[in-house]
Interface confidence: medium
């Protein structure tokens, strides 16, 4: 693999915890320089597999609010605006990292946590199981 | 509002940085216990707005590998398997948190960074702008 020399200006690490507990600066750097600031796009209404956005809030987590997509229909919306059950609306899921306060209610101590969130829905052709 | 008492067992905070710099335990807790192991599903191929997955790797970031979706077509796949340009394939984007080594190459010091990733694609009705 690539061996990158350690920066001599790094903070000291306590060997017993290293590198399990690290220092993290919460002043977030935003790489999304060229994105449209109006990010709450209306795809959730315009999609052929539309979805609702449900709030998932946990004050012990950072970010505290996550919006979860729930597909509105089992099928997909056809050209006539009706639900076509020959197709399926399915959630697109992604694993994301969040910070969980640990111990609970501590403002400056967290643990990394991985959670699975549904980001939106897409319309797929169903898998048909033929009975012999 | 809700006032939750601070846990007396919290690590001390250095006031000059608090709460900008926090301690984070990197032993990841995975909440996805009851999820379907077939998460790397074939939706990207079966969708009416199919997508390709591109690997984005950065050793100075945690997680170092992120998969980015790119829609295959401008239009959507119709019932005949052809691309219908009266509909649009669009990426569903999600802002995620990652850890960026800061200063660079330091094993135990990070900064939170948010990046916008495309998770998959969905098929939407286009917005038609009528010219007066």
């Amino acid at each position: 693999g690539i061996t990158i020399p350690r920066n001599p200006g790094c903070p000291n690490s306590e060997d017993k915890n290293f590198p399990r507990t690290v220092m993290v600066n919460l002043n977030i750097h935003n790489r999304n320089t060229n994105t449209n600031p109006k990010r709450s796009s209306d795809y959730y209404n315009r999609s052929t597999s539309p979805w609702n956005l449900h709030r998932n809030e946990d004050p012990e987590r950072y970010p505290s609010v996550i919006w979860e997509a729930k597909c509105r229909h089992l099928g997909c919306i056809n050209a006539d605006g009706n639900v076509d059950y020959h197709m399926n609306s399915v959630p697109i899921q992604q694993e994301i990292l969040v910070l969980r306060r640990e111990p609970p209610h501590c403002p400056n101590s967290f643990r990394l946590e991985k959670i699975l969130v549904s980001v939106g829905c897409t319309c797929v052709t169903p898998i048909v199981h033929h009975v012999a | 509002g809700i006032t939750i008492p601070r846990n007396p067992g919290c690590p001390n905070s250095e006031d000059k940085n608090f709460p900008r710099t926090v301690m984070v335990n990197l032993n990841i807790h995975n909440r996805n216990t009851n999820t379907n192991p077939k998460r790397s599903s074939d939706y990207y191929n079966r969708s009416t707005s199919p997508w390709n997955l591109h690997r984005n790797e950065d050793p100075e970031r945690y997680p170092s590998v992120i998969w980015e979706a790119k829609c295959r077509h401008l239009g959507c796949i119709n019932a005949d398997g052809n691309v219908d340009y009266h509909m649009n394939s669009v990426p569903i984007q999600q802002e995620i948190l990652v850890l960026r080594r800061e200063p660079p190459h330091c094993p135990n010091s990070f900064r939170l960074e948010k990046i916008l990733v495309s998770v998959g694609c969905t098929c939407v009705t286009p917005i038609v702008h009528h010219v007066a």
């Epitope: 977030i28 449900h54 709030r55 004050p59 | 939170l112």
Partner: antibody, heavy 117, light 112 residues
Framework: QVQLVQSGAEVKKPGSSVKVSCKDS?????????MSWVRQAPGQGLEWIGD????????FYGEKFEDRVTLTADTSTNTAYMELSSLRSEDTAVYYC?????????WGQGTLVTVSA | DVVMTQSPLSLPVTLGQPASISCKSS???????????LNWLQQRPGQSPRRLIY???KLDSGVPDRFSGSGSGTDFTLKISRVEAEDVGVYYC?????????FGGGTKLEIK
């Protein structure tokens, strides 16, 4: 106790813009709690404008306001901002910032914006 | 969008008597995480709104225990066991389960 202190009343001409600020006294949690903006026209009910997570800059807008409102935050001063452009007479209202767990637990004192020719 | 319908529009109550306000939503407010993000606000004349209840039934700190919230799914109720003079104002229900957030039209509580 959390205190949200908003900027003073404004009188604006139709077509112009207004920027309302909201300073949060709670330096401990504010960078990682959503800040919401709500408005109330004279004698009317409450209307949600949008949310911003100050530290992330993650923004959600109500559809009605999406084209005209810009929410921003300065985490170094714990201040959130709401800018509304292309003002019309029906934008005359008291604008509130609010934040806290599970929705709006704490509210600012409100900023009256009057749009008049 | 979720429509929140409050009743009654106006509620005249005698001091010391109970009061009840109903709030109905056009779709279930049970979130994907099992929580129901239904809240009640009080707005006294000339003041900013103040949250009384969150997650259907949890009282905010400093809210007298004569206030209580109940309900599930699409039907919710705010009750005041014994109305006091300081309770005069407009009460709003609002949901933050679904995007975008929506408020009820308000119920004006006044003393008979």
């Amino acid at each position: 106790q959390v205190q949200l202190v908003q900027s003073g009343a404004e009188v604006k001409k139709p077509g112009s813009s207004v920027k309302v600020s909201c300073k949060d006294s709670d330096s401990t949690f504010s960078p990682i709690v959503y800040m919401s903006w709500v408005r109330q026209a004279p004698g009317q009910g409450l209307e949600w404008i949008g949310d911003i997570l100050p530290s992330l800059g993650r923004i959600f807008y109500g559809e009605k306001f999406e084209d005209r409102v810009t929410l921003t935050a300065d985490t170094s001063t714990n201040t959130a901002y709401m800018e509304l452009s292309s003002l019309r007479s029906e934008d005359t209202a008291v604008y509130y910032c609010a934040r806290g767990d599970y929705g709006f637990a704490y509210w600012g004192q409100g900023t009256l914006v009057t749009v008049s020719a | 969008d979720v429509v929140m319908t409050q009743s009654p529009l106006s509620l005249p109550v005698t001091l010391g008597q109970p009061a009840s306000i109903s709030c109905k939503s056009s779709q279930s407010l049970l979130g994907s995480d099992g929580k129901t993000y239904l809240n009640w606000l009080q707005q006294r004349p000339g003041q900013s709104p103040r949250r009384l209840i969150y997650l259907v039934s949890k009282l905010d700190s400093g809210v007298p225990d004569r206030f209580s919230g109940s309900g599930s799914g699409t039907d919710f109720t705010l009750k005041i066991s014994r109305v006091e003079a300081e309770d005069v104002g407009v009460y709003y229900c609002w949901q933050v389960t679904h995007f975008p957030y929506t408020f009820g039209g308000g119920t004006k509580l006044e003393i008979k």
